[in-house]
């Protein structure tokens, strides 16, 4: 039985050219996290494996940095980065948990700073 829940940053916004941290947290389960996959819509961005460490997809290497923790840092943001991001937690013995984050990249300097995991 899957008892865990994923807490995410939810809907966040950031300025064009800036950086943002995407963060998820799995709670309410004792399952072992074996791997976390980060996806942007239909693209695999990065994987953090408990044994192998991080793999960043080559096409995103210049703008994606691992961490902090199991999170992902997006750099040099463009308006094309606006969209849905997913953290996919592979756990044993529970199975897979998925969290969703919506990022809006704004042209102006009025990006909100309210999101809990966002870079101030």
């Amino acid at each position: 039985m899957m008892t865990g829940t994923i807490e995410t940053t939810g809907n966040i916004s950031a300025e064009k050219g800036g950086s943002i941290i995407l963060q998820c947290h799995l709670s309410s389960t004792t399952a072992q996290v074996t791997q976390v996959n980060w996806e942007q819509q239909d693209q695999l961005l990065a994987i953090c494996n408990a044994d192998l460490g991080w793999h960043i997809s080559p096409s995103f290497k210049d703008r994606v940095a691992p961490g902090p923790g199991l999170g992902l840092t997006l750099q040099s943001l463009t308006v094309n980065d606006t969209g849905e991001y997913f953290c996919i937690y592979h756990t044993y013995p529970d199975g897979t948990y998925t969290g969703r984050i919506f990022l809006e990249v704004l042209e102006s300097s009025v990006a909100e700073h309210g999101a809990r995991f966002q870079i101030p």
Epitope: Q35, D42, L44, D51, L52, H90, Y92, P93
Partner: antibody
Framework: EVQLLESGGGLVQPGGSLRLSCAAS????????MHWVRQAPGKGLEWVAS????????SYADSVKGRFTISRDNSKNTLYLQMNSLRAEDTAVYYC???????????WGQGTLVTVSS | DIQMTQSPSSLSASVGDRVTITCRAS??????LNWYQQKPGKAPKLLIY???SLQSGVPSRFSGSGSGTDFTLTISSLQPEDFATYYC?????????FGGGTKVEIK
Amino acid sequence: EVQLLESGGGLVQPGGSLRLSCAASGFTFSSYSMHWVRQAPGKGLEWVASISGSTSSSSYADSVKGRFTISRDNSKNTLYLQMNSLRAEDTAVYYCARVPYDVWMDYWGQGTLVTVSS
Amino acid sequence: DIQMTQSPSSLSASVGDRVTITCRASQSISSYLNWYQQKPGKAPKLLIYAASSLQSGVPSRFSGSGSGTDFTLTISSLQPEDFATYYCQQSYSTPLTFGGGTKVEIK
């Protein structure tokens, strides 16, 4: 250098059993998921089974579920496939493959031929 | 199970030709799509992983693209050693499934 070497193939009668081995070297075996893939003569590739590195949790193709068992001995850097109740349609070359991040099969063994025939 | 449909099943081409092979998944698989090359009597060899990432040591004439359900393997300029059979494979969910293969033959 990463190397995977399968062994244990051969001729077996229908209903018989066989155990395949895959000896791994050149990498930290326990960190990687490992898979078995087979290829019937003149046919395409068919995934058979997988086993994770850290938890040894396993998955099987429906065609072999209940008959085949995948296992590993991380102390011996060896992957196994126990095949029971073999059928003619199990005749194939069996490959073991290393699967980093459970996504791609980056190294394959040379394969071992299993022939099920009376 | 996710079905992988590869096309064409075979093609004839000449050295220097640009070759395109397509693979379609029966449901969205994000970018969990890999491409392999196999020569007769040999084990498959990984060319492209995660739809578009070139495996280390693979010539840059090979490239992959696509996401969701439609994917493409392109060989920009076919070389003599590229005549082989090519397979796509999804790793989005088990059971893992392969396409039926595309045999690239000499014209």
